[in-house]
Interface confidence: medium
């Protein structure tokens, strides 16, 4: 989060998170401004000359939807300024001279989570936005799965799922005969120290995906040849 001191007596704290594609969502904590004031944040690109994007605050939130040709890349950075009208004059204050979207990432949740049951295991697959495909190897997932009647707090978790959009759950991990639910979330992977700065992302987990329901496969017993063991 970034703090803008502004020109008024009270400081404001803005938190702006990006889905790393075309959207930046901002939230601010500040007392309401006076009646008739329509505050906004202005994102001015430090990389694309002339690139400015207005984020009109409604209550304590605003969203910028970038045009397709402005899809975010790691080198993007913006100057954020806060604008509001007071006594008929526009007041401007600096919020962040170098806002790096890649340092404030909250991805959209994975979509189209599906299950495919076959003997002895369940294959889960999911989709990511085409705009994130160049970053597939930088995406890290966490899976939660449980019996349908259980609360999510009781779910088992599997994490450190990096760079893939599929996963196998073996039958022994599930309770045979029960319907199970699984859900997934994603974040930018934390990479090794030798990664160039421009490839280094930080942020938080996405919201959880829509869950998928599936019947647990039967566990396979040991294969016994027809003539039996010696």
């Amino acid at each position: 989060s970034v703090t803008g001191e502004g020109q008024g007596p009270r400081s404001r704290t803005f938190t702006c998170l990006t889905n790393n594609i075309l959207r930046i969502d901002c939230h601010w904590s500040a007392p309401e401004l006076g009646q008739g004031s329509s505050p906004w944040l202005l994102f001015t690109s430090n990389q694309a000359p002339g690139g400015t994007h207005k984020c009109i605050l409604r209550g304590s939130e605003c969203t910028v939807v970038l045009p397709p040709e402005a899809v975010l890349v790691p080198s993007d950075n913006f100057t954020i300024t806060f604008h509001h009208c007071m006594s008929g004059r526009e007041q401007v204050s600096l919020v962040d001279p170098e806002y790096l979207p890649r340092r404030h990432v909250k991805l959209d949740p994975p979509s189209d989570l599906q299950s495919n049951i076959s003997s002895g295991h369940c294959i889960l697959t999911w989709s990511i936005s085409p705009a994130l495909e160049p970053m597939t190897t930088l995406l890290s997932y966490e899976l939660a799965f449980k019996k349908q009647e259980e609360a999510w707090e009781q779910a088992q978790h599997r994490d450190h799922i990096v760079g893939v959009t599929w996963l196998i759950l073996e039958a022994f991990e599930l309770d045979p005969g029960f319907i199970h639910e699984a859900r997934l979330r994603v974040q930018m992977a934390t990479l090794e120290d030798d990664v160039v700065e421009e490839e280094r992302y930080t942020g938080q987990w996405s919201e959880w995906s829509q869950p998928v329901c599936f019947q647990a496969p039967q566990r396979q017993g040991p294969l016994i040849p027809p003539w039996g063991w010696p």
């Epitope: 690109s45 990389q47 694309a48 000359p49 002339g50 690139g51 400015t52 045009p67 397709p68 040709e69 402005a70 899809v71 975010l72 890349v73 790691p74 080198s75 993007d76 160049p134 970053m135």
Partner: nanobody
Framework: QVQLVESGGGLVQAGGSLRLSCAAS????????MGWFRQAPGKEREFVAA????????YYADSVKGRFTISRDNAKNTVYLQMNSLKPEDTAVYYC??????????????????WGQGTQVTVSS
């Protein structure tokens, strides 16, 4: 970071054709508008052609319209300039450039952040 390397230049007779290529490194090529510029000896660098990030829009200088065609292959991280009906006045060093030009015009040089080293095109009469 985007690195650009041009190739395909050379010596050609008037009326002939050349195809320039510009290979880009980096996984974010798909997000950049691409342009070709040229600089003849003793002259300013000038805009030749440009193509939007997804190939949906193309732009040409009047002097090359109908003769040159710009295209891109995002899967190969490459932009091309097909030059037909070449004239001696097309002789120049041709530069490839990449930029986020969603607010300024694609013909403006300051729109472009990354530049290649250039490839020489010589058209003899």
């Amino acid at each position: 970071q985007v690195q650009l390397v041009e190739s395909g230049g050379g010596l050609v007779q008037a009326g002939g054709s050349l195809r320039l290529s510009c290979a880009a490194s980096g996984r974010y090529f798909y997000a950049y508008g691409m342009g070709w510029f040229r600089q003849a000896p003793g002259k300013e660098r000038e805009f030749v052609a440009a193509i939007s990030y997804n190939g949906g829009s193309t732009y040409y200088a009047d002097s090359v319209k109908g003769r040159f065609t710009i295209s891109r292959d995002n899967a190969k991280n490459t932009v091309y300039l097909q030059m037909n009906s070449l004239k001696p006045e097309d002789t120049a060093v041709y530069y490839c450039a990449a930029g986020r030009w969603y607010k300024l015009g694609p013909s403006e040089q300051r729109t472009y952040r990354y530049w290649g080293q250039g490839t020489q095109v010589t058209v003899s009469s």
